[in-house]
């Protein structure tokens, strides 16, 4: 099941996703899509990168504000609305036959509290829900449940990457991502 991240209407949502380029600077294409990761690519793509830069964005509200060139491809959605709620797919598109790492995260957009000040709201939310509260520009806030953060290095668990450590030799090592298995 997806890890949930909470954002208030009108605030920025932060959905973490990263990988470790290996060697440093060897970037791989990434797509973010609305909806769970399909068999291939992303459905309803909201943002896509190539080996060098963001090359496709469906709205100016979608940004990669982390250090993209170090593999931080966390998605920031600015000024979220209730319609932004749902599952998002971050797919690290490592070249090779179905070699991708895929990670589903769930964004829950809530209406802002009318009375409770923000710090109390944050404390209440994180106590009530064992999930991430996303706030502003600064990434995820504290989480109530230790260890409930996703592994943002994206443990490889799918298809032709899951397997054959001894066959994923120099060629895969060359392919631009550090691969580690669950």
């Amino acid at each position: 099941s997806e890890v949930e991240y909470i954002a208030e209407v009108g605030q920025n949502a932060y959905l973490p996703c990263s990988y470790t380029p290996a060697p440093p600077g060897n970037l791989v294409p990434v797509c973010w899509g609305k909806g769970a990761c399909p068999v291939f690519d992303c459905s309803n793509v909201v943002l896509r990168t190539d080996n060098r830069d963001v090359n496709d964005r469906t709205s100016g509200r979608y940004w990669l504000k982390g250090d993209f060139h170090k593999g931080d491809v966390s998605l920031t959605i600015e000024n979220v609305t209730l319609a932004d709620s749902g599952v998002y797919c971050c797919r690290i598109q490592i070249p090779g036959i179905m070699n991708d790492e895929k990670h589903n995260v769930k964004l829950v957009v809530i209406k802002p509290a009318k009375v409770t000040p923000a710090p109390t709201l944050q404390r209440d939310l994180t106590s009530a829900f064992p999930r991430m509260l996303t706030t502003g520009e600064h990434g995820p806030a504290e989480t109530q449940t230790p260890g409930s953060l996703p592994d943002v290095n994206l443990t490889v668990s799918n298809f032709f990457c899951e397997l054959q450590i001894f066959t994923l030799t120099n060629e895969l090592r060359d392919s631009g991502a550090t691969i580690r298995t669950a």
């Epitope: 380029p21 600077g25 060897n26 970037l27 791989v28 294409p29 068999v39 291939f40 690519d41 080996n51 060098r52 598109q93 070249p95 090779g96 036959i97 179905m98 070699n99 991708d100 668990s157 799918n158 298809f159 032709f160 990457c161 899951e162 397997l163 054959q164 001894f166 066959t167 994923l168 030799t169 060629e171 895969l172 060359d174 392919s175 631009g176």
Partner: antibody, heavy 118, light 113 residues
Framework: QVQLQQSGGGLVQPGGSLRLSCAAS????????MSWVRQAPGKGLEWVSG????????YNADSVKGRFTISRDNSKNTLFLQMNSLRAEDTAVYYC???????????WGQGTLVTVSS | EIVMTQSPDSLAVSLGERATINCKSS????????????LAWYQQKPGQPPKLLIY???TRESGVPNRFSGSGSGTDFTLTISSLQAEDVAVYYC?????????FGQGTKVEIK
């Protein structure tokens, strides 16, 4: 040497089912990802399905999604393709193929013909 | 998915002459980080399964005669048989393994003129 021995093809009516088998020898099946690739009569090659070394992850082409299931029994060094709700357009020679790393198909079975016809 | 298109669909070449098959992908299969093109070539003789000839665009599989060579980068690739032999009569397929489902060209039939 590496060998992939296939069985299980035949004639089946539309809507019917078949199970293809691919017995591997000369290598340890659990160490490699495997695939099924098919070839309709007089046509080209089409990837159908794939499975990771452990069998924990499987992938199907859109054309067979929800109808075909790839699986493996590593203890018997055998790969399977369960084909349900078969259609006339599934008529083809089906090949099992070993994947090198996560890249290309380095060994192929001899192929088995599946004919879907009433 | 990446669409692979081969040309010509068939060609007839005299024994000992050069045969050239082209393959074009709908998007680049070159991964700039390692400068590798994720492209392979297969040979299929009548009644037989395909056989891997070349991978990474130009690396010959063990046992493949050196008259077979591959070249190209990005979206355009070529398989060359420098001196056609009778046993080379077959259908040849290119295949990308860069992304999405692995996809093949439609095949090129090579015959003796």
């Amino acid at each position: 040497q590496v060998q992939l021995q296939q069985s299980g093809g035949g004639l089946v009516q539309p809507g019917g089912s078949l199970r293809l088998s691919c017995a591997a020898s000369g290598f340890t099946l659990s160490s490699y990802a495997m695939s099924w690739v098919r070839q309709a009569p007089g046509k080209g090659l089409e990837w159908v399905s794939g499975i990771s070394g452990s069998g924990g992850s499987t992938y199907n082409a859109d054309s067979v999604k929800g109808r075909f299931t790839i699986s493996r029994d590593n203890s018997k060094n055998t790969l399977f393709l369960q084909m349900n709700s078969l259609r006339a357009e599934d008529t083809a020679v089906y090949y099992c193929a070993k994947i090198f790393g996560s890249y290309y198909f380095d060994y192929w079975g001899q192929g088995t013909l599946v004919t879907v016809s009433s | 998915e990446i669409v692979m298109t081969q040309s010509p669909d068939s060609l007839a070449v005299s024994l000992g002459e050069r045969a050239t098959i082209n393959c074009k992908s709908s998007q680049s299969v070159l991964y700039s980080s390692n400068n590798k093109n994720y492209l392979a070539w297969y040979q299929q003789k009548p009644g037989q399964p395909p056989k891997l000839l070349i991978y990474w665009t130009s690396t010959r599989e063990s046992g493949v005669p050196n008259r077979f060579s591959g070249s190209g980068s990005g979206t355009d690739f070529t398989l060359t048989i420098s001196s056609l032999q009778a046993e080379d009569v077959a259908v040849y397929y290119c295949q990308q393994y860069y992304s999405g489902p692995p996809t093949f060209g439609q095949g090129t039939k090579v015959e003796i003129k």
